[in-house]
């Protein structure tokens, strides 16, 4: 399911509940994705010892994964709502190719991997409605993404396991940073 339970307008389980605001919906959506990532990480960690690897070792697998930095305006110091929102949306769009890579990488959590991917697409739509400056958001080039995907899928098994772990870890961190920032908006 791309949205958390109870988010659908047809949900009649709690007819007297106030409809969620845009911010509440975004917050709930991120936490829903984070729960999905948590489940995927459990499978990855049970399958290999990648989770014990330090960030320094992982960094050698030079993936260009989106990461928050001071200049992005999402931290407490130098917080800038508009700059930060652009960074969050841009980062999520950049993560999409990596989430595509994660499909078929899981045995018992295949549906969970699909749910994380679809939920992220919904989250991007929610955030784009919130953003005023959509022109500042750069969309990744589909051709570049296609060749990156081919390259990642051609790696040996060990590197694929490492890549999977690193994507999940980085995506989790990016969403946590985003959630902290969005709660200030």
């Amino acid at each position: 399911a791309p949205v958390p339970p109870g988010e659908d307008s047809k949900d009649v389980a709690a007819p007297h509940r106030q409809p969620l605001t845009s911010s509440e919906r975004i917050d709930k959506q991120i936490r829903y994705i984070l729960d999905g990532i948590s489940a995927l990480r459990k499978e990855t960690c049970n399958k290999s010892n990648m989770c014990e690897s330090s960030k320094e070792a992982l960094a050698e697998n030079n993936l260009n994964l989106p990461k928050m930095a001071e200049k992005d305006g999402c931290f407490q110091s130098g917080f800038n709502e508009e700059t930060c929102l652009v960074k969050i949306i841009t980062g999520l769009l950049e993560f999409e190719v990596y989430l595509e890579y994660l499909q078929n990488r899981f045995e018992s959590s295949e549906e969970q991997a699909r749910a994380v991917q679809m939920s992220t697409k919904v989250l991007i739509q929610f955030l784009q409605k919130k953003a005023k400056n959509l022109d500042a958001i750069t969309t990744p080039d589909p051709t570049t993404n296609a060749s990156l995907l081919t390259k990642l899928q051609a790696q040996n098994q060990w590197l694929q396991d490492m890549t999977t772990h690193l994507i999940l870890r980085s995506f989790k961190e990016f969403l946590q940073s985003s959630l902290r920032a969005l709660r200030q908006m």
Epitope: D27, S38, K55, K67, F75, K172, E173, L175, R183
Partner: antibody, heavy 118, light 110 residues
Framework: SVEESGGRLVTPGTPLTLTCTVS????????MSWVRQAPGKGLEWIGY??????TWYANWAKGRFTISKTSSTTVDLKMTSLTTEDTATYFC???????????????WGPGTLVTVSS | NIVMTQTPSPVSGAVGGTVTINCQAS??????LSWYQQKPGQPPRLLIY???TLTSGVSSRFKGSGAGTQFTLTISGVECADAATYYC????????????FGGGTKVVVV
């Protein structure tokens, strides 16, 4: 394990740096927090340093307290313009990551006492 | 600015009885609330997180409930060892906050 060090008796206005040393923990994977407790009082949160390297502080701590990861096993708390009100036991605590978003503190050090007195 | 308010303090409970501690957030914090136990001369110890999930190794006599702004810690079958100060902590927002902890509730066992 988590252990704090650097607490001592200082005079008002003196800067002081406390160090939190962890063992068996990869600091790059965990959020860390500093919390203090004045004698006979409750817990008072100072700030967090998250895995994304961002630092978030309590309103009263901004500008006077600085948290930084100084190595893969140490986190510092730099304090300036200390007053007698800063007399407290300072705790360092590790955040948990088995759930995806949650700032619960599941491992605490024994604390280090800072006394500010003239 | 989220403020955490704990009541009552102190609270007394008889051995074998039940003690209830309340924690109120000034605005919704979803289920991002933890409970800690602290005994004199010791650091706090995490009991419950996500409002109701018991930390590994903690007795099932401790039960957390609530969501949004109202939370409760219930200790059933109170033992002498439960005499301590209990703190709630919000994990929802770390900006524009004076303290993520509640003021604490001292439990006296009689």
């Amino acid at each position: 394990s988590v252990e704090e060090s650097g607490g001592r008796l200082v005079t008002p206005g003196t800067p002081l740096t406390l160090t939190c040393t962890v063992s068996g923990i990869d600091l790059s994977s965990y959020d860390m927090s500093w919390v203090r407790q004045a004698p006979g009082k409750g817990l008072e949160w100072i700030g967090y340093i998250y895995t994304d390297s961002s630092t978030w502080y309590a309103n009263w701590a901004k500008g006077r307290f600085t948290i930084s990861k100084t190595s893969s096993t140490t986190v510092d708390l730099k304090m300036t313009s200390l007053t007698t009100e800063d007399t407290a036991t300072y705790f360092c605590a590790k955040g948990s990551t088995d759930y995806a978003f949650d700032t619960r503190l599941d491992l605490w050090g024994p604390g280090t006492l800072v006394t500010v007195s003239s | 600015n989220i403020v955490m308010t704990q009541t009552p303090s102190p609270v007394s409970g008889a051995v074998g009885g039940t003690v209830t501690i309340n924690c109120q957030a000034s605005q919704s914090i979803s289920n991002e609330l933890s409970w800690y136990q602290q005994k004199p001369g010791q650091p706090p110890r995490l009991l419950i997180y996500r409002a109701s999930t018991l930390t590994s190794g903690v007795s099932s006599r401790f039960k957390g409930s609530g969501a949004g702004t109202q939370f409760t810690l219930t200790i059933s079958g109170v033992e002498c060892a439960d005499a301590a100060t209990y703190y709630c902590q919000q994990g929802y927002n770390s900006n524009d906050v004076d303290n993520v902890f509640g003021g604490g509730t001292k439990v006296v066992v009689v």
